[in-house]
């Protein structure tokens, strides 16, 4: 058992059909010493007297909050979390599997420039009774400081019979050099509770390894004289970090038929601008991606041909 | 690719050429690499990031872009800063940090290359000859030190007597080429912007 | 005390269905994941399919994904395994299990894929 | 497609210290814990070893398992007539968990 945070306590339970569970020794936080009585949750029924109570945790029916009482009046709580561990993996109830870019991912992170600055999201099918607590840190053992704000519902889809939330939160490296050259990662912790259920989800990752440009701003066309080619022009995103000549981009140019099936001609380039031929009914889009570092393409940014 | 814009400085050209083909190298060997070995804790997350230059060269704080001499983050480790009076600098204390900036990378390079040549002297003695390095990387090392034309001192080749650990080479590899393709993209990037200046 | 007792196994056809059933009792069903195992006759053991305690998730291994399917009804304690397009080599004595660190084995039902 | 490698089989006289082998990956044995199964001829699996090396309770204290890297193996010290069965070991891999990875199984024969 341990406290995750004041009066709040997470019991570890192996978890498997008859298992013993693990013995909870609760005090109750009062000088008092005599005609003390113990309660679980809404119940009025009696557990037991005295200043501690010893109970049994096997299953979610044991754990709630227990009050000690005095004569009607309540001393102090302690509410019991359990924190399951399934054939030595703890459970992953709470959040859902993104399976991107790999199984068993359930935090996804990106960030838009080398600033240190960062965004996670994950995704849930469950709508009530549910917190998360996100903390993160540069490398484990000396860590250093990350600060991340709240974590928001940042959006709700329908999925087949189910709807999904997704939660996201932002996260920025108290003293990040864009420049420096990453040996420790970034580890991202993220604490669940739904009801009485407790469960923790890591992420550990190199911001280098995250990065997702913003799509190229401004993008223009420029037809040529006598031509059905047109000049493609367009600019750094402004979230992209600075300066251009050191955080350079690559840029991927793509001229797509209204038809999906149609081929799409593509053009790669480390200028701000390309010939294209313009055809009807088409769109011509531009996405970006460090030019040195592989890490996501942008979204794309597209401008129709006519 | 493309080379950027800018008209490049027939000086530095030939730098940020080389510099682009070793990191095409370098990204290269690191994929075979980890194809290759499979079954070795080889990928970003499983290894060790170590820098072997740590302490002996300061090639991100010695190339630092003005624009990053404001970030105090980046200021921490460096004995020598940009910033002068507020003021523009002088070409004397530009041409100054440029050529410290350049040394570093030599010096870079050179570690890297006695490393990379003792490392496969090794492993040109493994009875499974499951990999090596990739002789175009080494000649690519060998251009873009050339082009830099800096003189130092030559570093002997380590030897070992001992018999070695093929398993500890491989995974020592692994964590080179990591860490050497992270350089690779530091030089990379550091010629993009002096190619532009 | 834990008690898995299966039934539903039988001769069947190639291409056609049967559905497998496993009673819990002794436990509460509806708190810990189940698996579905099986063993063609010589062979070892062969993971089939996998259910979340409350059924939000499924799990099958490639060889049956599209053609078996498992199921729960917590209110009646029970798990079942609906196999469709039955193969030759689906012959085997299937087993369901609790999932953990101890766990708790169906004595086991036979389905015989023959024409 | 089994991913758990064991010698098909294994035998000893009676007294004898008999041990199995189960080898695996690093995605596998070597990231999760592994369990070690005797299935008697015609019976279900029964769990001889849980999380490497824990014995549920009943089980005699011949049998141990240990775990290093990416194999495993589970000793029976003093082999018995009775512990003739196959033997099988079981882990995840970190990438389909909660799908359960068995080893091809060994037959442990006792002698004389």
């Known amino acids: 058992i341990w406290e995750l945070k004041k009066d709040v306590y997470v019991v570890e339970l192996d978890w498997y059909p008859d298992a013993p569970g693990e013995m909870v020794v609760l005090t109750c936080d009062t000088p008092e010493e005599d005609g003390i009585t113990w309660t679980l949750d809404q119940s009025s029924e009696v557990l037991g007297s005295g200043k501690t109570l010893t109970i049994q945790v096997k299953e979610f029916g044991d754990a709630g909050q227990y009050t000690c009482h005095k004569g009607g009046e309540v001393l102090s709580h302690s509410l019991l979390l359990l924190h399951k561990k399934e054939d030595g993996i703890w459970s992953t109830d709470i959040l859902k599997d993104q399976k991107e870019p790999k199984n068993k991912t359930f935090l996804r992170c990106e960030a838009k420039n080398y600033s240190g600055r960062f965004t996670c999201w994950w995704l849930t099918t469950i709508s009530t009774d549910l917190t998360f607590s996100v903390k993160s840190s540069r490398g484990s053992s000396d860590p250093q400081g990350v600060t991340c704000g709240a974590a928001t519902l940042s959006a709700e889809r329908v999925r087949g019979d189910n709807k999904e939330y997704e939660y996201s939160v932002e996260c920025q490296e108290d003293s990040a050099c864009p420049a420096a050259e990453e040996s420790l990662p970034i580890e991202v912790m993220v604490d669940a509770v739904h009801k009485l259920k407790y469960e923790n989800y890591t992420s550990s990752f190199f911001i280098r390894d995250i990065i997702k440009p913003d799509p190229p701003k401004n993008l223009q066309l420029k037809p040529l004289k006598n031509s059905r080619q047109v000049e493609v022009s367009w600019e750094y995103p402004d979230t992209w970090s600075t300066p251009h000549s050191y955080f350079s981009l690559t840029f991927c140019v793509q001229v797509q038929g209204k038809s999906k099936r149609e081929k799409k001609d593509r053009v790669f380039t480390d200028k701000t601008s390309a010939t294209v031929i313009c055809r009807k009914n088409a769109s011509i889009s531009v996405r970006a991606q460090d030019r040195y570092y592989s890490s996501s393409w942008s979204e794309w940014a597209s401008v129709p041909c006519s | 690719r493309n080379l950027p814009v800018a008209t490049p400085d027939p000086g530095m050209f030939p730098c940020l050429h080389h510099s682009q083909n070793l990191l095409r190298a370098v990204s290269n060997m690191l994929q075979k690499a980890r194809q290759t070995l499979e079954f070795y804790p080889c990928t970003s997350e499983e290894i060790d990031h170590e820098d072997i230059t740590k302490d002996k060269t300061s090639t991100v704080e010695a190339c630092l872009p003005l624009e990053l001499t404001k970030n105090e983050s980046c200021l921490n480790s460096r004995e020598t800063s940009f910033i002068t009076n507020g003021s523009c600098l002088a070409s004397r204390k530009t041409s100054f940090m440029m050529a410290l900036c350049l040394s570093s990378i030599y010096e870079d390079l050179k570690m890297y290359q006695v490393e990379f040549k003792t490392m496969n002297a090794k492993l040109l003695m493994d009875p499974k000859r499951q990999i090596f390095l990739d002789q175009n990387m080494l000649a690519v090392i060998d251009e873009l030190m050339q082009a830099l034309n800096f003189n130092s001192e030559t570093v002997p080749q380590k030897s070992s007597l001992e018999e070695p650990d093929f398993y500890k080479t491989k995974i020592k590899l692994c964590i080179l080429l990591h860490a050497f393709r992270i350089r690779a993209v530091t030089i990379d990037r550091v010629m993009s912007y002096l190619n532009a200046s | 005390q834990v008690q898995l007792v299966q039934s539903g196994g039988g001769v069947v056809q190639p291409g056609r269905s049967l559905r497998l059933s496993c009673a819990a009792s002794?436990?509460?069903?509806?708190?810990?994941?189940m698996h579905w195992v099986r063993q063609a006759p010589g062979k070892g053991l062969e993971w089939v399919a996998f259910?979340?305690?409350?059924?939000?998730?499924?799990y099958y291994a490639d060889s049956v994904k599209g053609r078996f399917t498992i199921s729960r009804d917590n209110s009646k304690n029970t798990l079942y395994l609906q196999m469709k397009s039955l193969r030759a080599e689906d012959t085997a004595v299937y087993y369901c299990?609790?999932?953990?660190?101890?766990?708790?084995w169906g004595q086991g039902t036979m389905v015989t894929v023959s024409s | 497609s089994y991913v758990l490698t064991q010698p098909p089989s294994v035998s000893g006289t009676p007294g004898q210290r008999v041990t199995i082998s189960c080898s695996g990956g690093?995605?596998?044995?070597?990231?999760?814990?592994v369990k070690w199964y005797q299935q008697l001829p015609g019976t279900a699996p029964k769990l001889l070893i849980y999380?490497?090396?824990q014995r549920p309770s009943g089980v005699p204290d011949r049998f141990s398992g240990s775990k290093s890297g990416t194999s495993a193996s589970l000793a029976i010290t003093g082999v018995q007539a009775e512990d003739e069965a196959d033997y099988y070991c079981?882990?995840?891999?970190?990438?389909?968990?909660?799908?359960?990875?068995f080893g091809t199984g060994t037959k442990v024969t006792v002698l004389g």
């Open positions: 259910i979340r305690y409350d059924g939000s998730n499924k």
């Open positions: 002794g436990f509460t069903f509806s708190s810990y994941g």
């Open positions: 690093r995605s596998n044995i070597g990231s999760n814990t």
């Open positions: 079981q882990s995840y891999d970190r990438g389909t968990h909660p799908a359960l990875l």
């Open positions: 299990k609790t999932h953990g660190s101890h766990d708790n």
């Open positions: 999380a490497n090396d």
